[in-house]
């Protein structure tokens, strides 16, 4: 049903859903702090633009009695319950910030007349792609998939002269929310990744993964997994690995690789890490000081959600346009705005674009080094290190299938 919005006469409210089930186990207090910091910045920007308006946030908490798993598995109805609460209280703002679980976002989008924009820090799954009033501020699975297909096909770099068409995907069901949906997208038989690969098998047991590492009859030398180095070590330990195995470790929301004193452990030598380019000033910013690297990105997405709303509000007010219209609801895409840590670009479907960074472990220095970067906005690769000190033979990534002729 239509809910009246607190969104006019110089007073603009943001509804922030504070859900018990969340993509990352972040204390709600930290998210509140991020939102409040964002509000301060927005108020300053609007004031500087000569717009004398009030912007506030209303935090909507779920009671936590029914939906208390803390992760995203029981989140499907929690979002709808919160929306019902908003509806009953007649407290809908101009924009909804909150659902981070793919299940809850998908259900909320499906079951409501969304005449207002929804901004999510998460909602990584393919089922949340191409939603007209949904904006996602953390890299969704589709972006990962496009990078992987692009990289698999590449055969014109001095360190990668083979096109790949095969892969194993390790997915054991204990993944974090982001990893769950990233791997889910790679597993899906109808996905772009599956469509472009000739062979793909999902490994679900630790033993399956461990056996592949030295199996002479393996169908691919490439294994994709998602998580941090510790996750890999728990699985792989110090087991021997065939010399032409390449593990692609997807660990997007983790800045630790770029810290000065970090040394790569020996078990990372056959691994390429895919992560995001770190922010310029995040490491010492006030709101992120007490957050772990992953949670920093999550809280930052909330903060940037507020800044995005401020950006759109400013544009519409300056143009004398109404905020409670479908036009406003559909406007949160195909734009660049000034985020907390520099410009943030959203694609045509409201999904954040970013620079993905592929790292390798230098056998000389035992440090993580940048191999290449990839701009998801233009799907363009930027090679960085043309002579990487790889563990692999001839400093080239091996063929994905053992025994194919030289190239």
């Amino acid at each position: 049903s239509q809910v009246s919005q607190n969104c006019h006469n110089g007073s603009y409210e943001i509804s922030v859903l504070m859900m018990g089930n969340s993509a990352f186990a972040e204390p709600l207090k930290n998210l509140e702090d991020a939102v409040n910091e964002g509000l301060e910045i927005v108020r300053g920007r609007l004031q500087n633009a000569g717009l004398n308006v009030t912007v506030n946030a209303t935090f909507m908490y779920s009671d936590g009695l029914i939906h208390n798993s803390g992760d995203c598995r029981s989140s499907t109805c929690e979002g709808l319950d919160l929306l019902r609460k908003i509806s009953n209280a007649q407290r809908m703002g101009c924009v909804l910030i909150g659902p981070s679980c793919t299940y809850s976002t998908f259900q909320m989008y499906l079951d409501t007349e969304l005449s207002y924009p929804m901004i999510s820090a998460g909602s990584f799954g393919l089922s949340c792609d191409y939603k007209e009033t949904l904006t996602r501020l953390m890299s969704p699975a589709r972006k990962l998939m496009y990078f992987l297909v692009n990289f698999w096909k590449t055969n014109d770099l001095p360190f990668k002269t083979y096109s790949w068409s095969t892969s194993y995907v390790y997915k054991n069901g204990t993944e974090t929310e982001d990893c769950f949906w990233y791997l889910n997208a790679l597993e899906a038989s109808v996905s772009y990744f599956s469509h472009e690969l000739g062979f793909k098998v999902v490994l679900r047991q630790d033993k399956e993964f461990q056996d592949i590492l030295m199996d002479h009859n393996r169908k691919s030398n490439v294994i994709i997994m998602c998580g941090g180095p510790e996750f890999l070590y728990k699985l792989k330990g110090d087991r021997a690995v065939a010399e032409d195995i390449v593990i692609i470790l997807v660990d997007l929301f983790n800045d630790q690789y770029f810290e000065d004193n970090v040394t790569a452990p020996d078990y990372m030598k056959n691994v390429l890490v895919l992560t995001l380019s770190p922010g310029n000033s995040l490491l010492n910013s006030s709101f992120s000081r007490n957050l772990s690297p992953t949670k920093r990105d999550f809280a930052l997405a909330y903060l940037n959600g507020i800044l995005l709303f401020g950006h759109m509000l400013k544009i519409f007010l300056e143009n004398g346009e109404n905020i409670t219209t479908p036009k406003f609801a559909h406007a949160f895409r195909n734009l660049t705005f000034e985020g907390y840590d520099g410009p943030v670009t959203l694609d045509d479907w409201g999904d954040v674009d970013s620079t993905m960074v592929l790292l390798y472990t230098s056998v000389d220095t035992k440090k993580y080094k940048v191999l290449l970067t990839y701009d998801t906005h233009v799907n363009k690769t930027y090679p960085v290190d043309m002579s990487p000190t790889f563990t692999w033979k001839n400093s080239k990534l091996p063929n994905d299938i053992t025994g194919r002729g030289p190239q």
Epitope: T381, D385, M386
Partner: antibody
Framework: EFQLQQSGPELVKPGASVKISCKAS????????MNWVKQSNGKSLEWIGL????????NYNQKFKGKATLTVDQSSSTAYMQLNSLTSEDSAVYYC???????????WGQGTLVTVSA | QIVLTQSPAIMSASPGEKVTISCSAS?????MYWYQQKPGSSPKSWIY???NLASGVPARFSGSGSGTSYSLTISSMEAEDAATYYC?????????FGAGTKLELK
Amino acid sequence: EFQLQQSGPELVKPGASVKISCKASGYSFTDYNMNWVKQSNGKSLEWIGLINPKYGTTNYNQKFKGKATLTVDQSSSTAYMQLNSLTSEDSAVYYCAIDDYPAWFAYWGQGTLVTVSA
Amino acid sequence: QIVLTQSPAIMSASPGEKVTISCSASSSLNYMYWYQQKPGSSPKSWIYRTSNLASGVPARFSGSGSGTSYSLTISSMEAEDAATYYCQQYHSYPPTFGAGTKLELK
């Protein structure tokens, strides 16, 4: 529009060093690898090395290790190549060129003539 | 490192004539790259990834080849095509160039 403007010609004595510059404009300087290429007296082209302005990664042709040192100044979008212990063999035109993958050496500076003579 | 051998070293062609410049590699490559250089000027990227023309290159130019044998072809020679053409590989590090083919107008 990618543009690379190199410093002017240099006449230097044997044993000395020279530092030539390449100022970039019209694109995001830190995104693209900057290469340096040598061309001796109208002859063929020899790749010296590259530097990635964002990460500071350098790759050198083994032949030029110890001869050339590549650096960048991000604030002025300028790349530098220092050549040391110069001999007559180092007399050549030196070009900077950026990769715009999938094309290598996609855009070139106008070249800097270095003449080593007593 | 990979050695590229260009042939011929020098050639001349009349306007309208078809021209083929060859480049042979000392080991197998996936792609070849070509550059054009005119006297007193910098080289220009001309053909990348064997057969893709760089921006502004006339359609009379084409590139082909595989393995160790590659070529640049001009379907109909024009006066402005007189230049030196270099082939280049980046299949293996370091990148290397051929010695060049000087194409003159007859």
